[in-house]
Amino acid sequence: QRLSRAQQQLPLESLGWDIAELQLNHTGPQQDPRLYWQGGPALGRSFLRGPELDKGQLRIRRDGIYMVHIQVTLAICSSTSTSRHHHPTTLAVGICSPASRSISLLRLSFHQGCTIASQRLTPLARGDTLCTNLTGTLLPSRNTDETFFGVQWVRP
């Protein structure tokens, strides 16, 4: 679809092309399974264009269908920590607030591996906060080429 000259001069956010790519900041304290994310040019190859961070969690500011993607690599990894017979070691991405919209969007398990990755298209609404929960005793890598999380607005 061709853009008019006026549209070409508008920032991407105003066209609805919200996009974010985040890197891991830290894990939560005991009893908090959430991963806490950070983004911005000063941190390297991470950025937010439209979505925003709320206490390390990604908040959507524009309704639409989004591509959500995530990769997590474990810094402490062993055959036991990734075995189904050990702890339930899963990564779940979901809408955690508002409570009325709470739902799991992605669920992945570490099966004999140190890295998991997935993506999906899903409708998201303004105000949705996405949480990434890592269950089990796991320590993810903070290397930016190993652990990252992002969203990309695709269409209304």
């Epitope: 830290h26 894990t27 939560g28 304290p29 005991q30 009893q31 908090d32 810094a75 402490i76 990894c77 062993s78 055959s79 036991t80 920590s81 140190c114 005793t137 796991l138 320590l139 993810p140 890598s141 903070r142 290397n143």
Partner: antibody, heavy 120, light 108 residues
């Protein structure tokens, strides 16, 4: 300047307990995972235990699992190792060590170590 | 558990000579996650190399690491008097994180 200072070592009888401490300074303690590594006299280095920066994740070598407990107090910039049911083979110099920012357990700073001797 | 075997046990060399230290793993190390440390008597280990070949902050460029899979090498291009010490390799690709038992570099 990053500094790690261990304390709490000493002579203890088999079956006894000891609590090691590691006081950290010169870096944002809560940001970094930490480990304990030990070295028996004239022997190889052995990784003992690790803990995430937030304290939410703890990890142990099989040789100490169920006997040792790693913990941290980020408000005091201090790492701990509670050692119970001590055995003669636990005799070693115990080092606290800071993980790289990536969280991977290679150790860019070490303390000077504290000697634990388990003997009757 | 990955077993790391270091050789030789002792290396007798003179200052200015080249030192080549070997570390062999019992199985392939994930992503070449191998580190090298230097330890002098009565001191804590000091990180030299991580990721098999990346020099740690402040480490002189006479120290270099190489290798992949199961075979790794630490090279000291020209030995300085302060380089005589024990050198350990460590794998951190898989728990438990294991160390080799060291190579002692001594003055000939």
């Amino acid at each position: 300047e990053v500094q790690l200072l261990e304390s709490g070592g000493g002579l203890v009888q088999p079956g006894g307990s000891l609590r090691l401490s590691c006081a950290a300074s010169g870096f944002t303690f809560s940001t970094y995972a930490m480990s304990w590594v030990r070295q028996a006299p004239g022997k190889c280095l052995e990784w003992v235990s690790a803990i995430s920066g937030s304290g939410g994740g703890t990890f142990y070598a099989e040789s100490v699992k169920g006997r040792f407990t790693i913990s941290r107090d980020n408000s005091k910039n201090t790492l701990y190792l509670q050692m119970n049911s001590l055995r003669a083979e636990d005799t070693a110099v115990y080092y606290c060590a800071k993980h790289d920012y990536s969280n991977y357990p290679y150790f860019d700073y070490w303390g000077q170590g504290t000697l634990v001797t388990v003997s009757s | 558990e990955i077993v790391l075997t270091q050789s030789p046990g002792t290396l007798s060399l003179s200052p200015g000579e080249r030192a080549t230290l070997s570390c062999r793993a019992s199985q392939s190390i994930r992503s070449n996650y191998l580190a090298w440390y230097q330890q002098k008597p009565g001191q804590a280990p000091r990180l030299l190399i991580y990721g098999a070949s990346s020099r740690a902050t402040g480490i002189p460029d006479r120290f270099s690491g190489s290798g992949s899979g199961t075979d790794f090498t630490l090279t000291i291009s020209r030995l300085e008097p302060e380089d005589f010490a024990v050198y350990y390799c460590q794998q951190y690709g898989s728990s438990p994180f294991t160390f080799g038992c060291g190579t002692k570099v001594e003055i000939k």
